[in-house]
Interface confidence: medium
């Protein structure tokens, strides 16, 4: 008998090279094989459970950056007046959540912020839990 | 043929709002659906393997905090003279281990330490390994 | 019907007690049960996907340490002029990658660097993806 295969784990890596002041970051998924989707610069959560979250980037100017998942809830990450980020965390997310950025710069110029090495990874840690598509 | 489902992954999120000097932190599991159990302010390990461990909290006063898993072994985390923690780590735990806090304050007052946003998450990383219940 | 068992997750914990200047660290796997292999002081990657990577150690002298996975690619970790490391990260690795250290010391003496508590853990996060052995 063939041993059972794992169904694909919900995971995604998105890249961002540009953020807009008082808005968010323009995220793109470099691979078509991702098991999670991007919509309106947000990562769509279909499965309940813990997620491993990795966030990296170097910014062209000082900014404050938050990563949100649900209106009215605190951010997953919140960094104040930084020029780079290299953080890892764990959070419980659920069906219908959307993971998105909010960015504020402190310069008088309201230009885009360039990002080098900008990467956000989400990996579901509870396969077998509730999912809805 | 229906593809196999994942059996539930061993994981738990516990909260703590109070720690006792020279003792530990009072931990509670907010969800009844957790796949791991709390007993005597310890998280019980049933399955051998690597665990992803996330620890967060803001303390009402400066303290030294350690997270242990086995008598006679070094701590999983050890923080000296801090008022907050936001750490993530990986450790190999085994059946019969118990994850628990030890706390020491540096004040002469032996009051309980209040904790804001106190959260400890454990997620098993090696499903398919040995478990005993 | 018996619920399906998980095939073993690709994971490994290696230890290192010694690093050689302008070379790497001598890594050994303390367990024979690891699902990943060490070859020529490198950890061999057989499965595509995200990996959780934990790196710890205390060094006998100041050094610069990088953890590589593929020629011509940037490092997974890069630490400059440190005497200890306690880092965690996530990276996408693929079949044929090899995870290995590069170390440089700043002393005129070309002695080996001793390492206390040197530990590198890799845990595959995408079971069900492509593997080749």
């Amino acid at each position: 008998q063939v041993p059972p295969q794992y169904p694909p784990i919900q995971s995604i890596r998105v890249q961002f090279t540009r953020c807009e002041n008082e808005k968010g970051c323009i995220i793109t998924s470099p691979s078509k094989d991702e098991t999670m989707k991007v919509q309106d610069n947000s990562i769509i959560i279909n499965c309940d459970g813990f997620y491993l979250i990795s966030l990296k980037g170097y910014f062209s100017e000082e900014l404050s950056l938050s990563l949100y998942y649900r209106k009215g809830r605190g951010p997953l990450f919140s960094l104040s007046k930084v020029t780079s980020v290299d953080s890892i965390g764990v959070a419980y997310l659920a069906f219908k959540d959307k993971v998105y950025f909010n960015v504020t710069t402190h310069s008088t110029s309201y230009k885009d912020i360039q990002v080098n090495g900008g990467e956000l990874i989400l990996i579901h840690q509870n396969p077998g839990g509730f999912c809805a598509y | 043929q229906v593809p196999p489902q994942y059996p539930p992954i061993q994981s738990i999120r516990v909260q703590f709002t109070r720690c006792e000097n020279e003792k530990g932190c009072i931990i509670t599991s907010p969800s009844k659906d957790e796949t791991m159990k709390v007993q005597d302010n310890s998280i019980i390990i049933n399955c051998d393997g690597f665990y992803l461990i996330s620890l967060k909290g803001y303390f009402s006063e400066e303290l030294s905090l350690s997270l242990y898993y086995r008598k006679g072994r070094g701590p999983l985390f050890s923080l000296s003279k801090v008022t907050s923690v936001d750490s993530i780590g990986v450790a190999y735990l085994a059946f019969k281990d118990k994850v628990y806090f030890n706390v020491t304050t540096h004040s002469t007052s032996y009051k309980d330490i209040q904790v804001n946003g106190g959260e400890l998450i454990l997620i098993h990383q090696n499903p398919g390994g040995f478990c005993a219940y | 019907q018996v619920p399906p068992q998980y095939p073993p997750i690709q994971s490994i914990r290696v230890q290192f007690t010694r690093c050689e200047n302008e070379k790497g660290c001598i890594i050994t796997s303390p367990s024979k049960d690891e699902t990943m292999k060490v070859q020529d002081n490198s950890i061999i990657i057989n499965c595509d996907g995200f990996y959780l990577i934990s790196l710890k150690g205390y060094f006998s002298e100041e050094l610069s340490l990088s953890l590589y996975y593929r020629k011509g690619r940037g490092p997974l970790f890069s630490l400059s002029k440190v005497t200890s490391v306690d880092s965690i990260g996530v990276a996408y690795l693929a079949f044929k990658d090899k995870v290995y250290f590069n170390v440089t010391t700043h002393s005129t003496s070309y002695k080996d660097i001793q390492v206390n508590g040197g530990e590198l853990i890799l845990i595959h996060q995408n079971p069900g993806g492509f593997c080749a052995y």
Epitope: T17, R18, K56, Y58, S60, E61, T83, S84, D86, S107, S109, K111, D112, Q114, V115, N116, G117 | - | S66, G74, P75, S78, S80, K81
Partner: antibody, heavy 118, light 107 residues
Framework: EVQLVESGGDLVRPGGSLRLSCVAS????????MSWVRQAPGKGLQWVAF????????TFADVVRGRFTISRDYAKNALYLQMNSLRAEDTAVYYC???????????WGQGTLVTVSS | SFVLTQLPSVSVTLRQTARITCGGD??????VYWYQQRLGQAPVLIIY???NRPTGIPERFSGASSGNTATLTISGALAEDEADYYC??????????FGGGTHLTVL
């Protein structure tokens, strides 16, 4: 005093390889993003490659992508440009430049000349 | 990719105002940087993020940017200002783009 000193420039045949080095002093190398910028004889500046302070992010001009790699050695305070499959049009003075905010090239070296000719 | 257009040369009478322009599609939405390169020397950053001067750069140098044009202004040009001037931006793919350069002659 901040100093960037390039070396490794030489005469090389088309299709050949060369490795340029840039040694930094007078500032905290770890905190600075680094670039290579070139200038063909009698021509303007052309950016070539960038590596961020942590070494994890690199970008390249389209004309050198796949042929050139950029790397850094924190122990030696050194930046490198490995140039393969060289062409006549790669002939230029190559400058290394650094910036604490990576959009500025705050400091520049004096350059090293690379000549690609048969 | 993003193209920056500069006039090859500009002349100015000693102690008069020189203006060097840099054209590019909606360049006003990007941060613009200016470099001075004297003959036989390495470039020097003189303006960053449109209109900011690094420490040590004289006040006579200023910058502005809007629409499709960025401008470097030298108020009261001196003989030592004779040099090549390059504008630079980063495009949305994080590639640095330089203009072709403008040679300033001080008469």
């Amino acid at each position: 005093e901040v100093q960037l000193v390039e070396s490794g420039g030489d005469l090389v045949r088309p299709g050949g390889s060369l490795r340029l080095s840039c040694v930094a002093s007078g500032f905290t190398f770890n905190n600075y993003h680094m670039s290579w910028v070139r200038q063909a004889p009698g021509k303007g500046l052309q950016w070539v490659a960038f590596i961020n302070s942590g070494g994890s992010g690199t970008t390249f001009a389209d004309v050198v992508r796949g042929r050139f790699t950029i790397s850094r050695d924190y122990a030696k305070n050194a930046l490198y440009l490995q140039m393969n499959s060289l062409r006549a049009e790669d002939t230029a003075v190559y400058y290394c430049a650094s910036g604490s905010i990576w959009t500025h090239f705050d400091y520049w070296g004096q350059g090293t000349l690379v000549t690609v000719s048969s | 990719s993003f193209v920056l257009t500069q006039l090859p040369s500009v002349s100015v009478t000693l102690r008069q105002t020189a203006r060097i322009t840099c054209g590019g599609d909606i360049i006003g939405s990007k941060n613009v940087y200016w470099y001075q390169q004297r003959l036989g020397q390495a470039p020097v950053l003189i303006i960053y993020r449109d209109n900011n001067r690094p420490t040590g750069i004289p006040e006579r140098f200023s910058g502005a940017s809007s629409g499709n044009t960025a401008t470097l202004t030298i108020s009261g040009a001196l003989a030592e200002d004779e040099a090549d001037y390059y504008c630079q931006v980063w495009d949305n793919s994080n590639k640095a783009m330089f203009g072709g350069g403008t040679h300033l002659t001080v008469l």
